[in-house]
Interface confidence: low
């Protein structure tokens, strides 16, 4: 029904390139593939790719041709299963060519690695790279979305797209310029830092709907499009939720050639009913497709209808609110939710989600009383901590965030982070507080009313990286318990952790501690990566260091650093004075 | 399962008058606005009239103004637009919606206006 009514195709395959066109089909079958065998080289994937678009065409100049009836994944797993060195390159992975869809696909999916091990991406030089676009632009735009979709196999297809026509349109741009590094550097690292953060958004979308569900997704979504789209009916905003939710459950799938059909006809959809949805559109509605759903996705919030009546008479002072939620349990809780958050627009949605579950647990509770009424009537004082933990969490960390600045507040976040969960990879602890202590730049700046939908959800991002890391190797029965529990309770959650007392301290292994004259030549970012790593490493030999202690150390650390960068010889001064920091931090730390 | 079902409508001369009605279920009807939309052959749908959740505000489209009213019962989860002077441009099948959403949920009634 809706957007999505469509009538049956005799060829799946053929009623998507249809629809798509060759350009977007050929594009979204490379993400499909490259997001599945993550390994493969681009070539391979291009000669299936190439394959499949040809068996696309002869479906279209006839329907009833042989196959053309069968699904999509049957024919791309079909595809897949084809690569003659699945079982050297993916071990058992291969084995799920032995199943039958639907299994086989599941099969797939579960297989996809959040971190695989591929070579960081280093940028060429510019004028290298021109000539590589210049010389054959198709080959050098598919190479993009190939290396991206290996990287981030859970990437929204269809917004992977728009970040491949930003990425074209800024070669075709700065390549006849006169200093071309200058204006291409700053738009490749804008799309870097952009694609990074889209990729761990969707990631969170996904981890929504395979692990607690597409109620939690839902509701995740009822909460955010109502803050958006305040004036929009309760109904409306169903519809969207109902449409939303089919295109990411296609895209988290691996069912990209849909997602990104409905997803067009969802923004179409939108873009058609402004009037009755929100008056912030008309400029993304303006814009060609691919800019169009992006637009819809980060539109502002519209502003709150002015006459809305207080939220009590309906929730709480209702003799029918038990009839009500009795008659259509979700449907109730969705209402309030709605109402809640278009009223909110400065709650983040997992602390409107948090409110909405203890307003269900006071319902299931209190219908059942005696005295339904009389039991419920206070469940709103409930509300009141809530509000406040994560108030009083931003307003204290933004204070710290103000007085450190961004690399010394993620270093104050690194050995909070360690002392909590110090099993957890070295890598991944580095990354991730590195990522949380990125929340003081991007939200502190904020006034009252947007830092908390800024900094906790963003949070919810960064610390569901944190979850799908550790799933892949669990270490830590913390992390597993804060990740599993409940999806909006995570920060909590691990806000709550104390230092793990139970840890024992790593040994002490003075290679670690160990530097190169390699460590001048590389940029800021990535020295500082190379020290808080040397600070993780310390933490877990001594977790009881006290904030002093670790400071000294670092003190020296970045001072020799710093010496050994400016001496003649620099490796024999890393050789030489780096022995005499080890001692000098040995003794600091007791060690 | 939310279902609409559509019923009133007919063949009719120009001038005369209909009763439509929406049969409402599996869901809270009384909580949700409801419109009325028209498809008319070959064309695309055109919102035609909507009413709020308790039945005090309603909504119509330029060409029907005057003529149609909506109203609706909520204990009978039944939603209505009474047609007066109606004319062939009101040739259309009807269906009702839930909101201002212009997406189908039920196979809608014919309303055909003809001398």
């Known amino acids: 029904r809706g957007v999505f009514r469509r009538d049956a195709h005799k060829s799946e395959v053929a009623h998507r390139f249809k629809d798509l066109g060759e350009e977007n089909f050929k594009a979204l079958v490379l993400i499909a593939f490259a997001q599945y065998l993550q390994q493969c080289p681009f070539e391979d994937h291009v000669k299936l790719v190439n394959e499949v678009t040809e068996f696309a065409k002869t479906c279209v100049a006839d329907e009833s041709a042989e196959n053309c009836d069968k699904s999509l994944h049957t024919l791309f797993g079909d595809k897949l299963c084809t690569v003659a060195t699945l079982r050297e390159t993916y071990g058992e992975m291969a084995d799920c060519c032995a199943k039958q869809e639907p299994e086989r696909n599941e099969c797939f999916l579960q297989h996809k690695d959040d971190n695989p091990n591929l070579p960081r991406l280093v940028r060429p030089e510019v004028d290298v790279m021109c000539t590589a676009f210049h010389d054959n632009e198709e080959t050098f735009l598919k190479k993009y979305l190939y290396e991206i979709a290996r990287r981030h196999p859970y990437f929204y297809a269809p917004e992977l797209l728009f970040f491949a026509k930003r990425y074209k349109a800024a070669f075709t741009e700065c390549c006849q310029a006169a200093d071309k590094a200058a204006c291409l550097l700053p738009k490749l690292d804008e799309l870097r830092d952009e694609g990074k953060a889209s990729s761990a958004k969707q990631r969170l979308k996904c981890a929504s709907l395979q692990k607690f569900g597409e109620r939690a997704f839902k509701a995740w979504a009822v909460a955010r499009l109502s803050q958006r789209f305040p004036k929009a009916e309760f109904a409306e905003v169903s519809k969207l939720v109902t449409d939303l939710t089919k295109v990411h459950t296609e895209c988290c799938h691996g069912d990209l050639l849909e997602c990104a059909d409905d997803r067009a006809d969802l923004a179409k959809y939108i873009c058609e009913n402004q009037d009755s949805i929100s008056s912030k559109l008309k400029e993304c509605c303006e814009k060609p497709l691919l800019e169009k759903s992006h637009c819809i996705a980060e539109v502002e919030n519209d502003e709150m209808p002015a006459d809305l009546p207080s939220l009590a008479a309906d929730f709480v002072e209702s003799k029918d609110v038990c009839k009500n939620y009795a008659e259509a349990k979700d449907v109730f809780l969705g209402m309030f939710l709605y109402e809640y958050a278009r009223r909110h627009p400065d709650y983040s949605v997992v602390l409107l989600l948090r409110l909405a579950k203890t307003y269900e647990t006071t319902l299931e509770k209190c219908c059942a009383a005696a005295d339904p009424h009389e039991c419920y009537a206070k469940v709103f004082d409930e509300f009141k901590p809530l509000v406040e933990e994560p108030q009083n969490l931003i307003k204290q960390n933004c204070e710290l965030f103000e007085q450190l600045g961004e690399y010394k507040f993620q270093n104050a976040l690194l050995v909070r982070y360690t002392k909590k969960v110090p099993q957890v990879s070295t890598p991944t602890l580095v990354e991730v507080s590195r990522n949380l202590g990125k929340v003081g730049s991007k939200c502190c700046k904020h006034p009252e009313a947007k830092r908390m939908p800024c900094a906790e959800d963003y949070l919810s991002v960064v610390l569901n990286q944190l979850c799908v890391l550790h799933e892949k190797t669990p270490v830590s029965d913390r992390v597993t318990k804060c990740c599993t529990e409940s999806l909006v309770n995570r920060r909590p959650c691990f806000s709550a952790l104390e230092v793990d007392e139970t840890y024992v301290p790593k040994e002490f292994n003075a290679e670690t501690f160990t530097f190169h004259a390699d460590i001048c030549t590389l940029s800021e970012k990535e020295r500082q990566i190379k020290k808080q790593t040397a600070l993780v490493e310390l933490v877990k030999h001594k977790p009881k260091a006290t904030k002093e202690q670790l400071k000294a150390v670092m003190d020296d650390f970045a001072a020799f650093v710093e010496k050994c960068c400016k001496a003649d010889d620099k490796e024999t001064c890393f050789a030489e004075e780096g022995k005499k920091l080890v001692a000098a931090s040995q003794a600091a730390l007791g060690l | 399962q939310v279902q609409l079902v559509e019923s009133g409508g007919g063949l009719v001369q120009p001038g005369g008058s209909l009763r439509l009605s929406c049969a409402a279920s599996?869901?809270?009807?009384?909580?949700?606005?409801m419109s009325w939309v028209r498809q008319a052959p070959g064309k695309g749908p055109e919102w035609v009239s909507a009413i709020d959740s308790g039945g005090g505000d309603t909504r119509y489209a330029e060409s029907v103004k005057g003529r149609f009213t909506i109203s609706r019962d909520n204990a009978k989860k039944t939603l209505y637009l009474q047609m007066n002077s109606l004319k062939p441009e009101d040739t259309a099948v009807y269906y009702c919606t839930i909101g201002r959403s212009t997406s189908r949920v039920g196979q809608g009634t014919q309303v055909t206006v003809s001398s």
């Open positions: 599996g869901f809270t009807f009384g909580s949700f606005g």
